[in-house]
Amino acid sequence: SGTTNTVAAYNLTWKSTNFKTILEWEPKPVNQVYTVQISTKSGDWKSKCFYTTDTECDLTDEIVKDVKQTYLARVFSYPAGNVESTGSAGEPLYENSPEFTPYLETNLGQPTIQSFEQVGTKVNVTVEDERTLVRRNNTFLSLRDVFGKDLIYTLYYWKSSSSGKKTAKTNTNEFLIDVDKGENYCFSVQAVIPSRTVNRKSTDSPVECMGQEKGEFREI
């Protein structure tokens, strides 16, 4: 149903990383515009991205209000220049998105090694605690603030002179590992949420190696 010159949106897809959340859909509009609505399962619909010719809508501001809620969005199609026009049933055409629960589904962004410090045969590696757009008491929360101990980091490390890798894990943002004296090591980290079944792991961080700017070496 619907007017002869509008088509319903399709392929509605959530794209979300560290809670920055965008709804995407198809098709590119021809003589039509879109409006998006979002709601929790029990809440009222809120309209966003009014009469847009884009095929995406940033819904971050809505989902960060409660990242543990499950959200549903829908995309309405209207004829361009005649947004009051409706489908044959008296309503504009629309298509529902899949359900989306940010806490369970947002992708983990690529982490960054903030620093590493060697003291004798120990190295302390610190992972940057990335800020999210989730707010509490007017302050933005970090990834660790939001996920707590549900979020862990795996450190991959290896001697610059060798291919054999080792791993360590932490549910803070710091690792303390043993290294061989006089050897340079390289490091990479990955974020993981073990309790998830999908979107469990981030991509690996860029590799950082000792003897480069980020680190600090202290002989004790």
């Epitope: 890798k165 791993t167 360590a168 894990k169 043993d178 073990p194 998830r196 079944t197 469990r200």
Partner: antibody, heavy 117, light 107 residues
């Protein structure tokens, strides 16, 4: 239902090589590392290493570097372990298992390898 | 590399009794430790993860405690099917070493 189905028992001669397969089902293969563990008769469990199926990156215990090679085939959601230069010391049961970061929660049934002339 | 010392190697007990198995690590693991049960001819089965958390479907008579370098595993009110082998595993780092195992025998 999550399952890891391993290939059948192997009887090989010293110096030969063997490949053990571990066909997974019931979960998203690329989201979980696959562990490999050895258990010699009446002994404890020895960690061989693991592979991240998403990118093929491998980690080995030093005792198994050069002995074991871990690979995956994402299209068939199967992990493989290739063992080379086999000796009687390699006779054991070999397990694959799914790593959930905090533990290993599902295991294959085990593959018995016997190295004998 | 971190070493794990599991004790006792074997223990005899009676039905209904409680037993405790210990694992000591040569370096701190925080709570990155798991416990497994293995029945003869079978694969290991996860009982406890993150030192204290009971895996899905595991009876509540099994429990884990400890952090750092000392960890304990307890079975209260032993059942006939509990007289098998138990292993601890460090999951903090690689190599992901297992303890030598504890064989639980019926007295």
């Amino acid at each position: 239902e999550i399952q890891l189905q391993q290939s059948g028992p192997e009887l090989v001669k010293p110096g030969a090589s063997v490949q053990v397969s571990c066909k997974t089902s019931g979960y998203s293969f690329t989201h979980f590392n696959v562990y490999w563990v050895r258990q010699s008769h009446g002994k404890s469990l020895e960690w061989i290493g693991y592979i991240d199926p998403d990118n093929g990156i491998t980690f080995y215990d030093e005792n198994f570097m050069g002995k074991a090679t871990l690979t995956v085939d994402k299209s068939s959601t199967t992990a493989f372990m290739h063992l080379n230069s086999l000796t009687s010391d390699d006779s054991a049961v070999y397990f694959c298992a799914r790593d959930v970061t905090t533990a290993v929660d599902f295991w294959g049934q085990g593959t018995t390898l016997t190295v004998s002339s | 590399d971190i070493q794990m010392t599991q004790s006792p190697a074997s223990q005899s007990a009676s039905l209904g009794e409680s037993v405790t198995i210990t694992c000591l690590a040569t370096q701190t693991l925080d709570t990155w430790l798991a416990w497994y049960q293995q029945k003869p001819g079978k694969s290991p089965q996860l009982l406890i993860y993150a030192a204290t958390y009971l895996a899905d479907g595991v009876p509540s008579r099994f429990s884990g405690s400890g952090s750092g370098t000392k960890f304990s595993f307890k079975i209260s009110s032993l059942q006939a099917e509990d007289f098998v082998n138990y292993y601890c595993q460090l999951v903090y780092s690689s190599p992901s070493t297992f303890g030598a195992g504890t064989k639980l025998e019926l007295k």
